[in-house]
């Protein structure tokens, strides 16, 4: 019986060349979180392990920064970063909880005139 829920920043937009924080929060469960994985489609971006700390995938280490908290900061954004991002919480004894965030990276002028998905 998995009672937990993942809250995310939902659909967000950011400016090309800028940065964005991806945040998820697991609530409504007392389960022990052992690890959080951040993935983009099928690519692993980063892992935060309760005992071992952060590991950033080598192919992303120049553009991904750990935190704040269990979140992930994406830097030097390109239009190719547009897409789905997933936070995967590994917990005991509940198992796995997954949250989804959709990021749209916009050309600077577009972002200035309407961040369609920006969450206040």
């Amino acid at each position: 019986m998995m009672t937990g829920t993942i809250e995310t920043t939902g659909n967000i937009s950011a400016e090309k060349g800028g940065s964005i924080i991806l945040q998820c929060h697991l609530s409504s469960t007392t389960a022990q979180v052992t690890q959080v994985n951040w993935e983009q489609q099928d690519q692993l971006l980063a892992i935060c392990n309760a005992d071992l700390g952060w590991h950033i995938s080598p192919s992303f280490k120049d553009r991904v920064a750990p935190g704040p908290g269990l979140g992930l900061t994406l830097q030097s954004l390109t239009v190719n970063d547009t897409g789905e991002y997933f936070c995967i919480y590994h917990t005991y004894p509940d198992g796995t909880y997954t949250g989804r965030i959709f990021l749209e990276v916009l050309e600077s002028s577009v972002a200035e005139h309407g961040a369609r998905f920006q969450i206040p």
């Epitope: 022990q32 979180v33 309760a50």
Partner: antibody, heavy 120, light 108 residues
Framework: EVQLEEFGGGLVQPGGSMKLSCVAS????????MNWVRQSPEKGLEWVAE??????????HYVESVIGRFTISRDDSKSSVYLQMNNLRAEDTGIYYC???????????WGAGTTVTVSS | QIVLTQSPAIMSAFPGEKVTLTCSAS???????LYWYQQKPRSSPKLWIY???NLASGVPARFSGSGSGTSYSLTISSMEAEDAASYFC?????????FGGGTKLEIK
Amino acid sequence: EVQLEEFGGGLVQPGGSMKLSCVASGSTFSNYWMNWVRQSPEKGLEWVAEIRLKFNNYATHYVESVIGRFTISRDDSKSSVYLQMNNLRAEDTGIYYCTMVRRNWYFDVWGAGTTVTVSS
Amino acid sequence: QIVLTQSPAIMSAFPGEKVTLTCSASSSVSSSYLYWYQQKPRSSPKLWIYSTSNLASGVPARFSGSGSGTSYSLTISSMEAEDAASYFCHQWSSYPYTFGGGTKLEIK
């Protein structure tokens, strides 16, 4: 073998304050959730407070009857957990146990306890 | 909060007798979050059974646990003198964590 030792119990007047300490030896303290549980003939075993890991931003939880009066904290560098108790009441009397928990390792160890007596 | 009610409060058993202690929850508890502790006089509680049915390290195989939802039990297949103790059920499924009032098991 992991060992826990509590300190700081004793006799205190109603409305007074007391700080309990618990020191762990024999394991990597920072990997474990820490709890305080108390026991009295009137109330039996009663969970009091929990503090999780740095990984969890040191999240704390309390039983309702002590919220605003008790504060749990930890110092991983000293392998210690603390319980600051203010505005003590007669019903806070009991044996206070410090417990060290790692759910996914089926690990759950208790100290020998320290007695707190609230009486005028 | 989830209230755990244990019965009986006190019981005694002959050596070799089968013993069953029960723990009833006021609302459903996931079986993974239901633990049992053993406590002997002048000692602190020891984890005895975790996740409803798994024996903690060093616990004799004559102990077993079962249950789901709101009804759980601890069984000793053949009572021995060293099993005389108090047994407490515990849930950490929701805050506040709670304990049952305990069953004091005596040997006849």
